[in-house]
Interface confidence: medium
């Protein structure tokens, strides 16, 4: 069977006026997954995103991440899109005073 990923979005200051947003998917099986940042609903180009390898996490499941740099104040335009085993979900960038957003996808 399949195990749905836990998706976690974080933000960190990159440079003045910019922030780096990172979307992490963990504890999923099988290893095939789509994880990408979207702006206004459409996927960003590959060259504006950085991906981590899909790695085993030691529990028979996998983990990966994708990050991109965006302008501070435009967070609401960006979402992390995840597709795994025929299911998909969308995850927002947390507001500045809340650095974590967890969602276990069912």
């Amino acid at each position: 069977g399949s195990v749905p990923p836990m998706v976690n979005v974080t933000r960190s200051e990159a440079s003045e006026g910019n922030i780096t947003v990172t979307c992490r998917a963990s504890s999923f099986y099988p290893r095939n997954i789509t994880l990408t940042w979207r702006q206004d609903g459409v996927s960003l180009s590959h060259d504006t995103q950085q991906w981590g390898d899909v790695l085993p996490d030691g529990n028979g499941t996998y983990q990966t991440w994708v990050a991109t740099r965006i302008c501070q104040g435009e967070e609401q335009r960006f979402t992390c899109y995840m597709e795994h085993s025929g299911n998909h979900s969308t995850h927002p960038v947390p507001s500045g005073n809340s650095h974590h957003h967890h969602h276990h996808h069912h």
Epitope: L44, T48, Q76, H88
Partner: antibody, heavy 122, light 112 residues
Framework: QGQMQQSGAELVKPGASVKLSCKTS????????ISWLKQKPGQSLEWIAW????????SYNQKFTAKAQLTVDTSSSTAYMQFSSLTTEDSAIYYC???????????????WGQGTLVTVSA | DVLMTQTPLSLPVSLGDQASLSCRSS???????????LEWYLQKPGQSPKLLIY???NRFSGVPDRFSGSGSGTDFTLKISRVEAEDLGVYYC?????????FGGGTKVEIK
Amino acid sequence: QGQMQQSGAELVKPGASVKLSCKTSGFTFSDNYISWLKQKPGQSLEWIAWIYAGTGGTSYNQKFTAKAQLTVDTSSSTAYMQFSSLTTEDSAIYYCARHDYYGTSGAWFAYWGQGTLVTVSA
Amino acid sequence: DVLMTQTPLSLPVSLGDQASLSCRSSQNIVHINGNTYLEWYLQKPGQSPKLLIYKVSNRFSGVPDRFSGSGSGTDFTLKISRVEAEDLGVYYCFQGSHVPWTFGGGTKVEIK
């Protein structure tokens, strides 16, 4: 493709607010981006803002930031736009429209409501 | 804001004619993801607009193949190979690449 049913015509006084609704059916509401657009009689269209029903995230045309507020009620699959401090310049037909990022990977206003006529008059 | 300019304002045609509508953007409308989100809509009197073409040249579902879109950068064209009565109305081009998304002023296709 689903349905988008907008609320009926409104006659409102200057300075008042109005809340328009767009009730959807036939598709998974929370997967969708809904935009609102304005069209004055005999004129072109203006995009006001979008809302992503899954998260409530929004993006506004700066021109309408102080005027419009978009919300959704996922339990009834309905999108709302509240328009405030109305003037005669706000008299127009307002449309809701659904984006189609899944089926065609990038069509903005694929499916439209029938429009709501708002008339601002003393 | 990206200004979308459509010409002509009015296009008188005879049924069966080919019609060519032009749309020019004030700046390049390639999205940061590499796609060009240029769309064409038709609005008939008393109706909501309907999507015809998305991403410059892709016909939306149910749109007849007499409609075709082309162009790149800042210059775009919608062609109707043989105008039928149901094609009459106002055509709007639209760019969804740069916020705020903007429409052209429209071209009215009417009987000559």
